[in-house]
Amino acid sequence: QKSSIEKCSVDIQQSRNKTTERPGLLNCPIYWQQLREKCLLFSHTVNPWNNSLADCSTKESSLLLIRDKDELIHTQNLIRDKAILFWIGLNFSLSEKNWKWINGSFLNSNDLEIRGDAKENSCISISQTSVYSEYCSTEIRWICQKELTPVRNKVYPDS
Amino acid sequence: QKSSIEKCSVDIQQSRNKTTERPGLLNCPIYWQQLREKCLLFSHTVNPWNNSLADCSTKESSLLLIRDKDELIHTQNLIRDKAILFWIGLNFSLSEKNWKWINGSFLNSNDLEIRGDAKENSCISISQTSVYSEYCSTEIRWICQKELTPVRNKVYPDS
């Protein structure tokens, strides 16, 4: 007698053969907070930007990617302390002389009002109220994200 | 009338409430290759190590972590071309003067026989036959991984 979960696994695999659907994340893992269609994990320890990126990656997640001002505000509302900074997935690309998200896209200049310099070894952090350019070597907290909803026919081409 | 997938979603969510289980990946997404309990994605484009790490992260995956010599050999068996190099999730930590996996653990010196220097700005690549230390700025292919099996009570403490 199979459990409902085991039967589910068979059902989903059979369905996927027809639709190439990834099961995706149905709800947020323990300790992660849901914000709309994402799960967010706010770290409690500190790291430079690179190590923060690596940490999210090993959790099979991404440093936070912010789509627009609205998502920024909703994320900032989850930050309790005024002075705490969190790394997000945005840093300065020296070769392209522009702010670049870790998914390869460039920052739309209207999305975030960044305080600080756009220069080599600069990475972006957010606080409860602002968005700051900091040296990537600065050791602060960070935010990882996972997409919550299953996406049909989601594929992964190289960036 | 709910589809079997919709019923499954309910079943899994109800089950998770009891077990704090993440649905996890039931099988590999399209274009990913299964290797035991992992899904691997071999890139077709090239990037420096940092960008490779970022790419895996935005795919909600990790640069490849290799547990032991056996896993290395099985991974190398999937590489078709003798001359192609792929980044994995291992680089040199200058502060700790040691090879460090991106999950924070150190390399067990018996696991991989690395050809090349252990020094600043060195990252590890694998080929069909060997393991090499390369400058992290070198633009080569890379391998992302996702854990395949759902893990009960899997939590994500900070690294």
């Epitope: 320890t45 500190v46 430079p48 302390d81 005024k82 002075a83 705490i84 900074l85 969190f86 305080r115 600080g116 952090s125 109220t129 602002s130 700051y132 900091e134 040296y135 070597s137 600065t138 050791e139 602060i140 907290r141 | 502060s95």
Partner: antibody, heavy 122, light 108 residues
Framework: QVQLVESGGGLVKPGGSLRLSCAAS????????MSWIRQAPGKGLEWVSY????????YYADSVKGRFTISRDNAKNSLYLQMNSLRAEDTAVYYC???????????????WGRGTLVTVSS | DIQLTQSPSSVSASVGDRVTITCRAS??????LAWYQQKPGKAPKLLIY???ALQSGVPSRFSGSGSGTDFTLTISSLQPEDFATYYC??????????FGGGTKVEIK
């Protein structure tokens, strides 16, 4: 109990050396930026140096650059300040201070030790 | 380097008075400013950070305001234990982290 305790101060001749220590307890020392701040008798506060949680990033005030060395041992929950080529103007109470966590290099000092007096005189 | 100028350098006040201390930065520092209280023979104590955030355990009669170059520390109703020297400090991400010259609050 959350506290910082400095030690190692004393009387030293100009050109001499001293090593200050700061023992931390009651918090996760390895997660905080730590600093040394000094106060000359009857004067204001002067930031001297900071070290990041991992020890990878260090900065000094121009007045001590090349003479003082900050270091930390996270396994021992300890912060150090090696002071060489001491001058009369280095005479001060030296405080060890913790920065508010996760504000990075924006160093708000939320926990201070009681200080240790360094006197440089011939 | 960023200079901080505090005024007044000293103020005489009575218990129950409202006391205001100002701190002016030589260039804009956003909200990266802190206020400390120091009593004779003691270490300084953090009162306000991020220009206006009250540090845990600090009485609500202390408040901070301002951004850019001009900042204010206000004690709404002076208590006997508030007689001390107050320092502002700028904490922009680039050292050095300078302090103001201090304001001594004395009993009238």
């Amino acid at each position: 109990q959350v506290q910082l305790v400095e030690s190692g101060g004393g009387l030293v001749k100009p050109g001499g050396s001293l090593r200050l220590s700061c023992a931390a307890s009651g918090f996760t020392f390895s997660q905080y930026y730590m600093s040394w701040i000094r106060q000359a008798p009857g004067k204001g506060l002067e930031w001297v140096s900071y070290i990041s949680p991992s020890g990878a990033t260090i900065y000094y005030a121009d007045s001590v650059k090349g003479r003082f060395t900050i270091s930390r041992d996270n396994a021992k929950n300890s912060l150090y300040l090696q002071m060489n080529s001491l001058r009369a103007e280095d005479t001060a109470v030296y405080y060890c201070a913790r920065s508010l966590m996760a504000t990075g290099t924006h160093l708000y000092f939320d926990l201070w030790g009681r200080g240790t007096l360094v006197t440089v005189s011939s | 380097d960023i200079q901080l100028t505090q005024s007044p350098s000293s103020v005489s006040a009575s218990v129950g008075d409202r006391v205001t201390i100002t701190c002016r930065a030589s260039q804009g520092i956003s909200s990266w400013l802190a206020w400390y209280q120091q009593k004779p023979g003691k270490a300084p104590k953090l009162l306000i950070y991020a220009a206006s955030a009250l540090q845990s355990g600090v009485p609500s009669r202390f408040s901070g305001s301002g951004s850019g170059t001009d900042f204010t520390l206000t004690i709404s109703s002076l208590q006997p234990e508030d007689f001390a020297t107050y320092y502002c400090q700028q904490v922009t991400s680039a050292p050095p982290y300078t302090f103001g010259g201090g304001t001594k609050v004395e009993i009238k």
